[in-house]
Each structure stands twice: as C-alpha cells, then as structure tokens.
C-alpha cells in the first residue's frame, strides 16, 4: 500500500493515575476526507490493537464508548490519550494512520512511543 510518514514521540511517562498522552502527526500526501487512527501495542513480536477511531477531516475523533483511548484532531495531528494503564502495560505503542477516502488508500506507521507506567505506591494506613 502507499506509504505515508507518521511521527510520534519516542518516550512518554504515564501519570500516577495511569494516563499517557502523546501526539501522532502524519504527512498527508493528498486531501483525505476520512482518516482512521489506530493505536497498536507491540510486545516481543506480537502486535495487538489497543484502540481505533475514524474521523472525517474537520470533525472530532470518535472512539468506541468502551475504549481506553480518547483523542482530538487538528489538521494532520492527532492528540491521543490512553487511560487505565498499569505497570504491566509498559511497552511500545505504535500510531497507525490510514487515509481511507478518497482513494488511493495510504497507510502510515509510526516508530512507536515507549510508554512507561509505574504503579503508585499504596498509601500507608493512617490513624485519625
């Protein structure tokens, strides 16, 4: 398929509440009207889909209601937020962008963002 450049940060540290945000930017070779953005997680040689959203240019991203991802779009830039992360979710998160319409189809894969998640220390019991 026709290739497209996608840029994303190399490293992001999740907040203590398990939230990680990063920007995914793509170099659109044409005037796409419908774009699909997918977050993939690569662990070892396994690639799994974390979440996906489609948006019409000029409109907002819409993830499924039960998705752990939210996001906003601005031109060729997508701001992605992944919630509910725990230490075991530390890994490489790849931004994939597909220009669905109009033809031809373009696909771009970022190099991935290494997201580090540190579980918060449990609060010690305190007497009041």
């Amino acid at each position: 398929c026709k290739a497209m450049h996608v840029a994303q940060p190399a490293v992001v540290l999740a907040s203590s509440r398990g939230i990680a945000s990063f920007v995914c930017e793509y170099a659109s070779p044409g005037k796409a009207t419908e774009v699909r953005v997918t977050v993939l997680r690569q662990a070892d040689s396994q690639v799994t889909e974390v979440c996906a959203a489609t948006y019409m240019m000029g409109n907002e991203l819409t993830f499924l209601d039960d998705s752990i991802c939210t996001g906003t779009s601005s031109g060729n830039q997508v701001n992605l937020t992944i919630q509910g992360l725990r230490a075991m979710d530390t890994g490489l998160y790849i931004c994939k962008v597909e220009l669905m319409y109009p033809p031809p189809y373009y696909l771009g894969i970022g190099n991935g963002t290494q997201i580090y998640v540190i579980d918060p220390e449990p609060c010690p019991d305190s007497d009041f």
Epitope: C1, K2, A3, T38, L40, V47, T48, E49, T54, K96, E98, M100, Y101, P103, P104, Y105, L107, I109
Partner: antibody, heavy 123, light 108 residues
Framework: QVQLVESGGGVVQPGRSLRLSCAAS????????MHWVRQAPGKGLEWVAL????????YYADSVKGRFTISRDNSKNTLYLQMNSLRAEDTAVYYC????????????????WGQGTLVTVSS | EIVLTQSPATLSLSPGERATLSCRAS??????LAWYQQKPGQAPRLLIY???NRATGIPARFSGSGSGTDFTLTISSLEPEDFAVYYC??????????FGQGTKLEIK
Amino acid sequence: QVQLVESGGGVVQPGRSLRLSCAASGFTFSSYGMHWVRQAPGKGLEWVALIWYDGSYKYYADSVKGRFTISRDNSKNTLYLQMNSLRAEDTAVYYCASAYYDLLTGPYYFDYWGQGTLVTVSS
Amino acid sequence: EIVLTQSPATLSLSPGERATLSCRASQSVSSYLAWYQQKPGQAPRLLIYDASNRATGIPARFSGSGSGTDFTLTISSLEPEDFAVYYCQQRSNWPPYTFGQGTKLEIK
C-alpha cells in the same frame, strides 16, 4: 481447511439484477478483507470490489461503481455481491477471494479463492 | 491506476527447463507485488507475495525477484503441472487492485 463457495450465478437479461453469495469456512472470516474478482470468458482477471474485515469500508472498480454493492455478514461467515443494472460486459466468472488484514501493512493479497460462479448477461 | 504489463504473452518450454516471466509496472509499486498461477477451469492460486516470498505450500522451484517497476517470476526446473497461466498483481496503489494480462506457459 479453508473453503470459499460462491453461489447465485446464472443467466440474466441486461438491466436486471442478481445477488451472489460466498460462504466461507475454515478460517477466521472476521479477520479478513473480502474481495470479488471476475474473469470474462477467455480473458484475464479484473478486481471488482473489496469490503473491510469489519464491513466498515467498501471500495469498487470504476466499471461497477454505482451498480454493484458488496456486503458481508460476519455472523454467517458470508460475503455478498448485489449486482444491479447488469450489462453484457459484466458476463464473467465471479470469484470471491479473501485477503488477510495485517495490522502493520494493511490489506494483503488474495490468499484464498472460491471456485467461481458464472454470470451471463444476455437477452 | 497502475498498469502491469507481462511478457512474454506466451512462453513455450519443455519440462525440466527454466522459465523466466516478467512483469513491469507503469510506476513504482515498491515490493508490493504478487504472482498467481491459474490452471484451466480452476481459480487462481497465490504463489509469491511481496515480490519474493513464497506462499504456504509453494515448491522451492518457484522464486520471485524485483522491486520498483521490474519483477521476475522464475521456475527453476519446470514440472508438467507448472504449465498454466501466470498473473502478477499489485497492492501498492489501490483502488483499483490491478493484474497483469497474464503469461501463458505452454508445453513446447
């Protein structure tokens, strides 16, 4: 083993409609994009239409756009091609073919094919 | 639309000989090219994908090479069952997916 079985072909008059079906088994149908490819008698292969693995996107060859509609029912492992306003030049063997959707490289090649069903458009 | 041109249209060879089939694209398709074999009355079968990778169950005598606009399918030593029509197909710039017009490999 993988099986794709087309049905619904036959002889039809120009301007009329026909619906083809393709029953799939032996693989995870919902992970595969599905195509229709046709072959006119004694001619080469011509791609007709593609539907995304989850049915969300559809693409057509210019020669059938606006006349043919591709659809799928993942609960029934079945692919369809609704053909309207048929023309003599639509006469061909119609094959359904699967194409795995790779997460990193997108839709793949036509890895499994049915045996084909013949559609003849003639008055 | 990318046009794929195959040559020769017909290739007459004997079993045991080496067959070289060519496919040329009207613009670069990188390595996103496949080869299919079709025997009379049968559906096509995927032989080679991404220019040089053999599909599952395809004998080692089949090999593919090339990138950009020029591709080659080689059958190192022809077996009787290899005589068929061969098509190349690209997935670089779609829709539409396009096929070459085919090369008929016949027994000399």
